[in-house]
């Protein structure tokens, strides 16, 4: 499929101008190429009329031109003093003309309307209102005003003075008489439907003098804005119907077959399945403006997009409308990545999340789609070391492994962590890309103990039990603040006995935290990588009290107590159920938070991406 | 939960200069942003000033730009409000705020947040 994208249809009227702008991926090769505009004749061949070369034709002489924006990567062919004779079906391309790299688009000029003396010409767009003046003279003060339209060579009664409403018109026409002092009546008609456009004569009196005055009705179908954006990107419809609708539901719907347009999302609370996670609509303003994004481009999303006001929430005749022709450009410059992520409850799961590789220094975020109301994305996690408080010692987000790709990790997972996550940066370059994490039947692959309580001024040693399957990555132990995770030392204590069926490859790693202090209470992290791709972690509180008795603390043996979370293994190794914990004062002494902001330094973790479309929290 | 604690109000000229702090205590890791409120005798609370914790951005209310500037200094939890060139229509009680939930809507990448933490407020008073 050519990506080349322009307008399908443009139409004009004799004597005006119009300008057609036609969008390219601005790749370098595609900005500096030629750049064309070419008529297509009847046996297939396409007629160069003007191009970025300098070439003009002669039936283009003096009132066309084409221009170039490789910065935007589109261009723009004018035409002027428009005849019968420009319409036709032409291409605008790049390269050589019978190469493909082009978009076919159809020009219409209609001859001008054929007007009789004194007609004012009223342009109104669809779904808007007109008031057409009618003025009279004194003698036809007292007598019945009326609006007439002509149908073929008949004139059809509208609506007049006595009270009669043609029924095509009921609801939404209403005939006002100026005060005293002003010689003139006006027709208002709101809700313009396509089928109002046409011929009307006002009328002060039925005799032979009456005062009469011709109109000329125009009801334009708004000309759709083009849009051209990434496959995986995200595109933002911006809809500002005015304040008279700034009470009725709006939506934005896409226009299937014929004239059916079926609704994307609504004020009403109504949202296509097949955006489910990937759309927002914002609350609206009180002029009636509103807008939606809408991340993830699918190829299938292409196509004609409207926004309106309607009390039902959808399409109807007379409704105000914007236009949109949306293509998907599939030579996108976004990478793919996993839309689907998988992790067990009680396991952990690690995002990547592309960005524009320039803009290395831009915030990164993460956030929850919530689809409640129209949609919110409430920010769990970002960059510059903020997560979310519910979020504390099981989320991270680190800039590894660069290079155009940051990672997210969260564990302690929950079904409740099941849903839409946006990738984000504040960067120009407006990348959002959407990942559904889903959690699935299964047990964790790395074990550790619950929460353990560290004694002041003694030694900690605290186990992690990696499956076989993790022989061959780099093990690891970190302490969690809210900038990352940090490296510390561990040691690997030989084969683990916490796996069934596992070969001496399972391996058991500890942390040792030697003469704990205060400082060492908070969140540890032990996983897996394979160098800045991070796989499984799992989380263990560490919670310090004062000294009770002497001796060291090695928390790998099961205890008879054990909780009721907790099942005992044959190993001897008690399995925890990591439940996600809101706060660690349910363990520990209240205690003031600090702030771990500037701790910025240090080890910061990543994941195998698994399938192109799919990632599993664990890593296979 | 986040607590705030204002100081630094007081009585001052007009054209005079005051600094008001807010030491912040608790989950201040989930603190998104700060902000200072008002409140004048029988009116609305209304906004004056707001940072991001991590200083990169700050908005101010028309009436307070260019004489009143918002800052933060992270090692000790606190942000100020520098109030220069003082009115007797700045005189009302200035609040503290923290948020904590910022989010998404369409007019990303603009960041939202709603102030859902408040200290008690301290008195600032401005003679003619």
């Known amino acids: 499929k050519s990506p080349i994208f322009g307008p399908e249809e443009v139409n004009s009227v004799e004597g005006n101008s119009v300008s057609i702008t036609c969008y390219y991926p601005p790749t370098s090769v595609n900005r500096h190429t030629r750049k064309y505009w070419c008529r297509q004749g009847a046996r297939g061949g396409c007629i160069t009329l003007i191009s970025s070369e300098g070439y003009v034709s002669s039936k283009y002489a003096g009132r066309a031109n084409l221009t170039n924006f490789p910065e935007n990567g589109t261009f723009v062919v004018n035409i002027a003093q428009l005849s019968q004779d420009d319409s036709g079906r032409y291409k605008c391309g790049l390269g050589i003309n019978s190469r493909g790299l082009s978009f076919d688009v159809s020009l219409e000029v209609s001859q001008g309307p054929g007007l009789l003396n004194d007609t004012k010409v009223y342009t109104v767009d669809l779904g808007r209102t007109v008031t057409i003046n009618c003025p009279f003279k004194t003698e036809n003060a007292q007598k019945r005003k009326s609006l007439y339209k002509q149908i073929g060579l008949y004139p059809v009664l509208v609506i007049d003075s006595s009270g009669y409403v043609n029924p095509n018109y009921t609801g939404r026409i209403r005939l006002d008489i100026q005060g005293t002092g002003q010689l003139l009546f006006s027709v208002v008609i709101n809700q313009l439907r396509l089928s109002d456009a046409g011929q009307y004569l006002c009328q002060a009196g039925d005799d032979s003098n009456s005062n009469k005055k011709n109109a000329d009705l125009q009801v334009l179908k708004p000309e759709p804005e083009l849009v051209y954006e990434d496959l995986r990107g995200s595109v933002t419809f911006h809809c500002a119907l005015g304040p008279e609708v700034a009470n009725v539901a709006k939506f934005l719907c896409r226009q299937s077959s014929g004239e059916n347009c079926d609704v994307v999302v609504n004020t009403l609370g109504k949202r296509a399945p097949a955006f489910e996670g990937r759309i927002l609509l914002n609350p609206q303003d009180k002029d009636g403006s509103f807008s939606v994004v809408i991340t993830g481009l699918r190829k299938e999303d292409a196509g004609r997009y409207l926004c309106g006001a309607h009390s039902d929430g959808q399409l109807q005749e007379g409704s105000p409308i914007q236009a949109w022709q949306l293509f998907v450009n599939e030579e996108s410059t976004i990478p793919r990545s996993p839309t689907v992520v998988k992790g067990v409850a009680g396991g952990s799961v690690a995002v990547l999340c592309p960005y524009n590789r320039k803009e290395s220094k831009s915030i990164k975020y993460w956030c929850l789609w919530e689809g409640a109301q129209n949609g919110r994305c409430p920010l769990l996690v970002d960059s510059e070391g903020w997560v979310k408080a519910q979020y504390e010692g099981r989320l991270s987000l680190l800039e590894e492994p660069g290079n155009g790709t940051f990672t997210v990790i969260l564990n302690q997972l929950t079904s409740r962590d099941a849903g839409f996550y946006w990738c984000l940066t504040n960067g120009d370059t407006l990348w959002r890309t959407t990942v559904e994490i889903k959690i699935i039947e299964g047990e964790p692959n790395l074990k550790v103990p619950g929460n353990v309580t560290a004694v002041l001024g003694e030694t900690l040693k605290v186990p992690c039990h990696f499956p076989c399957k993790f022989s061959s990555y780099e093990k690891y132990w970190c302490k969690w603040n809210n900038t990352g995770c940090q490296a510390l030392p561990s040691q690997d204590e030989g084969p683990s006995k916490a796996f069934v069926n596992c070969d001496e490859n399972s391996r058991l790693v500890s942390l040792t935290l030697n003469l704990v202090t205060r400082a060492d209470e908070g969140w540890y992290w032990c996983g897996v990588k394979q160098g800045h791709f991070y796989g499984e972690t799992a989380a263990v509180y560490v919670a310090v009290e004062e000294r009770k008795a002497a001796g060291s603390r090695d928390v790998s043996l099961a205890k008879a107590d054990a909780a009721p979370d907790e099942k005992v293994l044959d190993s001897g190794f008690r399995e925890i159920e990591n439940k996600a914990i809101q706060d660690p004062r349910l363990f520990a002494e209240e205690k003031a938070v600090a702030d771990t902001r500037d701790q910025a330094d240090g080890s910061r973790a990543s994941v195998d991406s698994g399938s192109s479309e799919e990632q599993g929290g664990s890593s296979r | 939960q986040v607590q705030l604690v204002e100081s630094g109000g007081g009585l001052v000229q007009a054209g005079g200069s005051l600094r008001l702090s807010c030491a912040a205590s608790g989950r201040t890791f989930s603190v998104y942003a700060m902000g200072w409120f008002r409140q004048a005798p029988g009116k609305e609370r209304q906004f004056v000033a707001a940072?991001?914790?991590?200083?990169?951005?700050?908005s101010y209310a028309d009436s307070v730009k260019g004489r009143f500037t918002i800052s933060r200094d992270n090692a000790k939890n606190t942000v100020y409000l520098q109030m220069n060139i003082l009115k007797p229509e700045d005189t009302a009680v200035y609040y503290c705020?923290?948020?904590?939930?910022?989010?998404?809507?369409?007019?990303?990448?603009?960041?939202?947040?709603?102030?859902?933490?408040w200290g008690q407020g301290t008195l600032v008073t401005v003679s003619s």
């Open positions: 705020a923290a948020a904590t939930n910022p989010y998404f809507s369409d007019y990303y990448p603009d960041l939202k947040y709603e102030f859902d933490y």
């Open positions: 940072i991001t914790w991590s200083g990169g951005s700050t």
